[in-house]
Interface confidence: low
């Protein structure tokens, strides 16, 4: 496993946001911007890949506009001057709705995917290696911005999935400290570890053509449901699991289970028929006491996309939905490394899983 220096994600950064891309853009780098379009009066937002923080040199300006029926502008700015616009007269975003926006940097272009579907490609007008900053502004709320390194090694498929290992390098965990990066929670800086981006097979027995390219950057069918995969190394303090998907319009329930052998260490069970998010643990086929309290209204909505971020801490799991902290679930099964299986089932379509 070749661990290379993917940077830690920016968690729930305030907008407008500007952040460094460590090492700059590289061929094969995948950057995921996950957030929600505000339903307020603002009609635009933008993601910029630029040199420095001034905004005078923007290699790629990605600018959805909720105007004139909705369209997306792509452009480049050099020395303060904009070039000719490239317009896509289809609007894949909706006001008030969450989104998963992925940018794949390739030698000739940027490929942009919205909610798992290839949306546009933008050919480089300036050398992309000059880019060292990502900025986001406008009518949007961010859940996270994550980075997946280009150098990947395919690993053996677990069940029907084709995971690609994506190395992520965090600072060593300071003994006895939990530091607070910008974000939802004070996520533990993790030891060097690996993250796996899961994709599905495009046809039985056939993987996507080039394993060296982050697979999420290609259109793919829905994940098979139920979706089951191994969590390499199991849980440990600072381990994150990210899932995004769409709730089916007629959904009754779905579940996300973190399992240890025959036990379900963590059962996350949104129930639309009860307007509840139920959490529980099952040990030896016996359920414990349910936890249902929420700090706000049910965050999952039929027919809408969502992201779930599960952060393992020493004493609990912290769960955020669409970038907002929802609840903590104190470990009932404390043997964290044995919690090494993720199971997702029910009335959703998955678009992205990162363990």
């Amino acid at each position: 496993m070749a661990f290379s220096g993917s940077q830690a994600p920016y968690l729930s950064p305030a907008v407008p946001f500007s952040g460094t891309i460590q090492g700059g853009l590289q061929d094969g780098l995948q950057i995921t911007v996950n957030g929600t379009v505000l339903s307020s009066s603002g009609t635009r937002f933008a993601v910029n890949f630029q040199t420095g923080f001034s905004g005078n040199d923007i290699a790629f300006h990605f600018n959805p506009r909720f105007e004139d029926g909705g369209y997306v502008v792509c452009n480049t700015r050099q020395n303060g001057s904009w070039g000719p616009e490239e317009r896509k007269t289809h609007m894949p975003f909706q006001k008030g709705m969450p989104f998963d926006l992925c940018f794949l940097v390739q030698s000739s272009d940027f490929k942009v995917m919205v909610n798992g579907i290839l949306f546009v490609q933008y050919f480089h007008r300036v050398p992309f290696h000059r880019v060292d900053t990502i900025s986001v502004n406008g009518s949007v709320q961010l859940s996270y911005i994550s980075f997946q390194n280009p150098r990947t090694v395919p690993v053996q498929p677990a069940f029907s999935t084709v995971p690609f290992s994506q190395p992520v390098c965090f600072p060593p965990r300071p003994r006895g400290r939990r530091q607070k990066p910008p974000g939802v929670w004070p996520a533990n800086p993790a030891p060097i570890t690996q993250t796996v981006i899961h994709t599905v097979q495009s046809a039985p027995g056939q993987m996507f053509s080039t394993p060296a390219i982050p697979p999420m950057m290609y259109p793919h069918p829905a994940y098979p449901m139920p979706f089951i995969t191994t969590i390499l190394g199991g849980l440990y303090p600072s381990k994150s699991i990210l899932l995004s998907g769409t709730v089916l319009p007629s959904a009754q329930r779905f579940h996300i289970n973190l399992c240890s052998g025959n036990h379900i260490a963590f059962h996350l069970n949104p129930r639309f028929d009860e307007n509840a998010v139920v959490r529980n643990t099952q040990i030896d086929n016996s359920w414990g006491s349910e936890e249902r309290s929420l700090p706000r209204k049910m965050p999952f909505v039929r027919g809408q996309s969502f992201s779930v971020w599960i952060l393992c801490e020493a004493h609990c799991l912290k769960v955020a939905v669409d970038g907002q902290h929802l609840f903590e679930y104190y470990h009932r099964l404390r043997n964290l490394p044995t919690i090494n299986r993720l199971e997702v089932g029910g009335d959703i379509q998955l678009t992205h899983v990162q363990t």
Epitope: R178, R334, N335
Partner: antibody
Framework: EVQLVESGGGLVQPGGSLRLSCAAS????????IHWVRQAPGKGLEWVAA????????DYADSVKGRFTISADTSKNTAYLQMNSLRAEDTAVYYC??????????WGQGTLVTVSS | DIQMTQSPSSLSASVGDRVTITCRAS??????VAWYQQKPGKAPKLLIY???SLYSGVPSRFSGSRSGTDFTLTISSLQPEDFATYYC?????????FGQGTKVEIK
């Protein structure tokens, strides 16, 4: 019935060492964290150290870091606190406590450590 | 380290009184705060966890609440057995910290 029983306390000279034990029973030891919390005479509670026995993660208060070592033997359902380079200010009743998924829900009766010449 | 500043350090009250003890965290600790009761010569006992959840077997006159980084333990009607010292404790940071304690005495 859940029980935690501390032992190993006593009188020790400054600079000396002691090892405290916390024998657990009545629950699956490997599913819980064990904490040591101390209380100096007439003072409040001070968290000392914790071990997450399933993972081996340990954490220490700054005041004891480098001098105290927490460990656990899951086969014996016992946690330990090895205390070296003891100082007068380490004099206290030392409690071990189990941290479940809701907090430190069970505590031992405590063992007194006196550091004095 | 996260500091938990508890107040008052002591209070005098009568049986039947409503008693409120507060704890302020020096930074956000989410809802990862517990409250303990300790009587002289005894180990602490868990009363409240996750800021507002009542521990099993604890009388319902005890309650906890959170407002940002301020946490409150309330005893709605003080009983004779409630005269003790109360501590808050955060478990948000890996370095757990306790408040300095509030001694509830008989007036």
């Amino acid at each position: 019935e859940v029980q935690l029983v501390e032992s190993g306390g006593g009188l020790v000279q400054p600079g000396g060492s002691l090892r405290l034990s916390c024998a657990a029973s009545g629950f699956t030891f490997s599913r819980y964290a064990i904490h040591w919390v101390r209380q100096a005479p007439g003072k409040g509670l001070e968290w000392v150290a914790a071990i997450y026995s399933p993972t081996g993660y340990t954490d220490y208060a700054d005041s004891v870091k480098g001098r105290f070592t927490i460990s656990a033997d899951t086969s014996k359902n016992t946690a330990y606190l090895q205390m070296n380079s003891l100082r007068a200010e380490d004099t206290a009743v030392y409690y071990c406590a189990r941290e479940g998924y809701i907090g430190m829900d069970y505590w031992g009766q405590g063992t007194l450590v006196t550091v004095s010449s | 380290d996260i500091q938990m500043t508890q107040s008052p350090s002591s209070l005098s009250a009568s049986v039947g009184d409503r008693v409120t003890i507060t704890c302020r965290a020096s930074q956000s600790v989410s809802s990862a705060v517990a409250w303990y009761q300790q009587k002289p010569g005894k180990a602490p006992k868990l009363l409240i966890y996750s800021a507002s959840s009542l521990y099993s077997g604890v009388p319902s006159r005890f309650s906890g609440s959170r407002s940002g980084t301020d946490f409150t333990l309330t005893i709605s009607s003080l009983q004779p057995e409630d005269f003790a010292t109360y501590y808050c404790q955060q478990s948000y940071s890996a370095l757990y910290t306790f408040g300095q304690g509030t001694k509830v005495e008989i007036k």
